[in-house]
């Protein structure tokens, strides 16, 4: 069954945590649907963003942070492992110095920490996708 | 009650027709939600687009056409009559030489015809909005 989109869930992250998302683009790549995943510092959507991950399907991925309400320097990748019309599984793992983003089991993007992952309080998944799975796995200490 | 998004409806347009849309952005303007309205030449979403109207709420509006699968010259406007968090009523009227876009009763954008409005077979409304009304009014002959 489908999860509501935008999908918002409280989350606590640290090294070893993984966020897993399964979904499907709502439109063909010609129409440039988007997927966005935002790691927020508060439960409010207007809060700062520790890690912003936005896919323009078929075109590019941009990653960034929003600090004190302002977007910082964008990191762009043309790597496009997503398939037109196909379901995807996205996993974002918290490594000691960066986020590692896997798409369908393949390491596809990295983003070095600008803000501590421990500052994350909420994850939001939204834009032009249907969502079937959202999970945060925590490192067993 | 809410209409499904993306929302797709068969439509025939000509001078005098008006497409009316009521909805609300799904996120605060800081997060840059989008609204897109596309007038397609076929019932297929990958078909050409006679009039493409995309709002990046709080930032800008772009208008364009897609002909033989390729985007043409984009028209951009910084005019932003939409209000953060507020419902909007959008009406797109087919005038003899152009589309006239009204937002909450106020004339806000125009787009000169590149392709005959009679070529339109389908209208799609999508991206980051909830949709409460969609109507196509036809000129009484």
């Amino acid at each position: 069954s489908l999860l509501p989109v935008p999908y918002t869930e409280a989350a606590s992250l640290s090294t070893g945590s993984t966020v897993t998302i399964k979904g499907r683009p709502l439109a063909c790549f010609l129409n440039e649907p988007y997927l966005q995943v935002d790691f927020h510092t508060e439960m409010k959507e207007e809060s700062d963003i520790v890690f912003h991950f936005q896919v323009c399907f078929g075109r590019r991925v941009v990653m960034n942070s929003r600090e004190y309400g302002a977007w910082k320097q964008q990191v762009e990748s043309k790597n496009m492992p997503f398939q037109d019309g196909q379901e995807f599984e996205l996993s974002i793992s918290v490594l000691p110095d960066k986020y590692q983003v896997m798409v369908n089991g393949q390491s596809s993007y990295t983003f070095d920490h600008r803000i501590k992952p421990e500052a994350v309080k909420m994850v939001q998944v939204w834009r032009d996708i249907s969502l079937t799975k959202f999970n945060v796995s925590y490192l067993k200490r | 009650s809410l209409l499904p998004v993306p929302y797709t409806e068969a439509a025939s347009l000509s001078t005098g027709s008006t497409v009316t849309i009521k909805g609300r952005p799904l996120a605060c303007f800081l997060n840059e939600p989008y609204l897109q309205v596309d007038f397609h030449t076929e019932m297929k979403e990958e078909s050409d687009i006679v009039f493409h109207f995309q709002v990046c709420f709080g930032r800008r509006v772009v208008m364009n056409s897609r002909e033989y699968g390729a985007w043409k010259q984009q028209v951009e406007s910084k005019n932003m009559p939409f209000q953060d968090g507020q419902e909007f009523e959008l009406s797109i009227s087919v005038l003899p030489d152009k589309y006239q876009v009204m937002v909450n009763g106020q004339s806000s954008y125009t787009f000169d015809h590149r392709i005959k409005p009679e070529a339109v077979k389908m209208v799609q409304v999508w991206r980051d909005i909830s949709l409460t009304k969609f109507n196509v009014s036809y000129l009484k002959r």
């Epitope: 510092t41 910082k72 320097q73 600008r114 | -």
Partner: antibody
Framework: EVQLVESGGGLVQPGGSLRLSCAAS????????MSWVRQAPGKGLEWVSP????????SYVDSVKGRFTISRDNAKNTLYLQMNSLKPEDTAVYYC??????????????WGKGTLVTVSS | QSALTQPSAVSVSLGQTARITCQGG??????VSWYQQKPGQAPVMVIY???ERPSGIPERFSGSSSGSTSTLTISGAQAEDEGTYYC??????????FGGGTELTVF
């Protein structure tokens, strides 16, 4: 072994210009953020301008905005600082520093020995 | 990122524990690094990511952060630890800031 060697410092009159260079070796230069940090005589450390990896945009401490320009040439493994309209208060040792990662958030793990810039008439 | 405040000087007897504080940061969100600088030399990183030590830095150096205060602790201070210590925090380039520096004396 990581090495950062600054050059281009010297004595310059107020209103003059200098271009500092930092030659980097021993690491993949293009993968790391870099920064210029200065230290006026007897004073503390002050960020001048950091630049993230592969970046064509940068930021500057308020006191040098519009006068200084940081740039990097990843092909030449070199960091630059173009300093225009120099003022006496720009007199300092200028250090080139390498970040631990592609952004400066995680700190600067290697520093050059510094080059002295003196602005005086 | 607002200014970071450090005491201008800290004294400690040989072999005792020295604590240098850094206040005013948003340390719940931003990492802290600490640097040691000896006269006429370039700074050397002694702590990064709040509490991690670069290779070659003795175990007596440690760090901790909570709220708006970060602390550098030198357990069993040695004569060679004398110098000026700077904290640094922030994230993206326009948020980076140094503390004013603390001169450590070991007597």
């Amino acid at each position: 072994e990581v090495q950062l060697v600054e050059s281009g410092g010297g004595l310059v009159q107020p209103g003059g210009s200098l271009r500092l260079s930092c030659a980097a070796s021993g690491f993949t230069f293009s993968s790391y953020a870099m920064s210029w940090v200065r230290q006026a005589p007897g004073k503390g450390l002050e960020w001048v301008s950091p630049i993230n990896s592969g970046s064509d945009s940068a930021s500057y401490v308020d006191s040098v905005k519009g006068r200084f320009t940081i740039s990097r040439d990843n092909a030449k493994n070199t960091l630059y600082l173009q300093m225009n309209s120099l003022k006496p208060e720009d007199t300092a040792v200028y250090y080139c520093a390498k970040a631990r990662t592609s952004v400066v958030a995680g700190g600067m793990d290697y520093w050059g020995k510094g080059t002295l810039v003196t602005v005086s008439s | 990122q607002s200014a970071l405040t450090q005491p201008s000087a800290v004294s400690v007897s040989l072999g005792q524990t020295a604590r240098i504080t850094c206040q005013g940061g948003k340390f719940g969100s931003y990492y802290v690094s600490w640097y040691q600088q000896k006269p006429g030399q370039a700074p050397v990183m002694v702590i990064y990511k709040d509490n991690e030590r670069p290779s070659g830095i003795p175990e007596r150096f440690s760090g901790s952060s909570s709220g708006s205060t970060s602390t550098l602790t030198i357990s069993g201070a040695q004569a060679e630890d004398e110098g000026t210590y700077y904290c640094q925090s922030g994230s993206s380039s326009d948020n980076i800031v140094f503390g004013g520096g603390t001169e450590l004396t070991v007597f």
